[in-house]
């Protein structure tokens, strides 16, 4: 029962996480105009992965897509790629995990197959979450770098003609949505991997046989013999799960160069 709950909860958490990753990727507010020096601007700028927008005091909002591919910064392209990979992996993971759910019966699918599928989807969710977190963190790092560069050089000459105040950008709502969504997908993936452990059927235990010796009766349970078989099919499950554990380790050892953001 606990395994079913863990699997179901992992699925739901991952589903919410992937929905969040999709939402973050589509959102326009990845970076928003920093209003520290100008809190009463009548023109508010914000940018997404796909287009930049300007909201005017009049209520009019104008958005322009980035219609160039080669002219975009490599970092932005990398962030786009990470988010798309995260969405694709997450979507495949969701599809796999639906069939892996213990509460859903599909033909005569064995529990071992469901365990494998649960683990596969779990790993996919973990990688998906990592992609989203990495993508958002790379973008955040890019913003921090640009923010301090523009702070150090607040006034830049436009074509040598005139002095204009450079617009500074800070973290937009999409970054926080992305971080949370990536984290949820990651947690969901870990839960799926944990659920996988209890899903696989243990090799049928031999029934205890009583040997009646003269004088006193001793019951022998051939646990030692079972151990000598190497846990049968469980060896495979244990091994795969350990792989999942290594993925968890990867989460912990993931480069923390964005920690300061």
């Amino acid at each position: 029962m606990a395994v079913t709950a863990c699997q179901g909860l992992g699925f739901v958490v991952s589903l919410i996480g992937i929905a969040g990753i999709i939402a973050a990727t589509c959102m326009d507010q990845w970076s928003t105009q920093d209003l520290y020096n100008n809190p009463v601007t009548a023109v508010f700028n914000y940018q997404g992965l796909w287009r930049s927008c300007v909201r005017e005091s009049s209520g009019f909002t104008e958005c322009r897509g980035y219609f160039t591919l080669l002219g975009l910064p490599a970092m932005l392209q990398a962030v786009r790629a990470l988010m798309i990979v995260g969405i694709v992996l997450g979507a495949i993971g969701l599809l796999v995990s639906i069939f892996a759910l213990k509460c859903i019966r599909i033909g005569s699918m064995e529990d071992s197959a469901k365990a494998n599928m649960t683990l596969t989807s779990g790993i996919m969710f973990i990688v998906s979450g990592l992609c989203a977190i990495a993508g958002v963190s790379v973008f955040a790092n890019m913003l921090v770098t640009n923010f301090w560069m523009s702070t150090a050089n607040m006034y830049t000459g436009m074509g040598g003609m005139v002095q204009t105040v450079q617009t500074r950008y800070t973290f937009g709502a999409a970054l926080f949505v992305g971080w949370v969504a990536g984290g949820l997908t990651l947690i969901g993936g870990v839960m799926m991997c944990i659920a996988c452990r209890g899903l696989a059927p243990e090799e049928t235990n031999y029934k205890a046989v009583s040997y009646h010796a003269s004088g006193h009766s001793v019951a022998y349970k051939p646990g030692g013999f079972k151990a000598s078989t190497g846990f049968g099919s469980n060896t495979k499950n244990k091994k795969i799960y350990d792989g999942g554990a290594r993925t968890e380790d990867e989460v912990q050892s993931y480069p923390s160069k964005h920690d300061y953001v």
Epitope: V40, A42, V43, N45, Q47, S58
Partner: antibody
Framework: EVMLVESGGGLVQPGGSLRLSCAAS????????MSWVRQTPEKRLEWVAT????????YYLDSVKGRFTISRDNAKNTLYLQMNSLRAEDTALYYC?????????????WGQGTLITVSS | DIVMTQSPDSLAVSLGERATINCKSS????????????LAWYQQKPGQPPKLLIY???TRESGVPDRFSGSGFGTDFTLTISSLQAEDVAVYYC?????????FGAGTKLEIK
Amino acid sequence: EVMLVESGGGLVQPGGSLRLSCAASGFTFSTYTMSWVRQTPEKRLEWVATIVGGGGYTYYLDSVKGRFTISRDNAKNTLYLQMNSLRAEDTALYYCARMGLTQRNALDYWGQGTLITVSS
Amino acid sequence: DIVMTQSPDSLAVSLGERATINCKSSQSLFNSGNQKNYLAWYQQKPGQPPKLLIYGASTRESGVPDRFSGSGFGTDFTLTISSLQAEDVAVYYCQNDHTYPLTFGAGTKLEIK
């Protein structure tokens, strides 16, 4: 046809209060950001306050902040300016103006104005 | 606050001649987000409210004759009347539409020589 008609002006003593109204017609009032602009006796134009379509955001000239309150009743298509603690320097012709949706925050329609004289 | 400085204070031009009014802002009115300048020009005739002529520094408001044109970028802007007509006699104001408070220039009085 877009029409803005101001009312509520008159003579008031320093420290007194007054409420200006602006009746709007000929457009979807709730969609537009509205402003009050005044013209001093020296013919200088001075923006006073702005309120966005939904009424959630308001902006004020520093010298009127805390004394004037801009508000709107979208059901009645009316813009208001509540003026308290009036001073002699508030004497002006007060215009109600609409901020054009696609006019880069420019004021595309103006009323005829209502005169306020603050004097003892 | 952004200070808008108009020049000249008054201008006398012969009918059919070109009239040029300048406006300078203390801060840039250019928005990098959409590459637009947030400056408007208004015309005010005696006893009337101001009328919008130009917005976004160079876009003519609908119904405004094409003899009126706006130009400029960042902090320096110009309103040009290519061929002055008798009905163009008025006071012209420039306005910052970029940052609150939405400040106006002191105005330029245009007369016929």
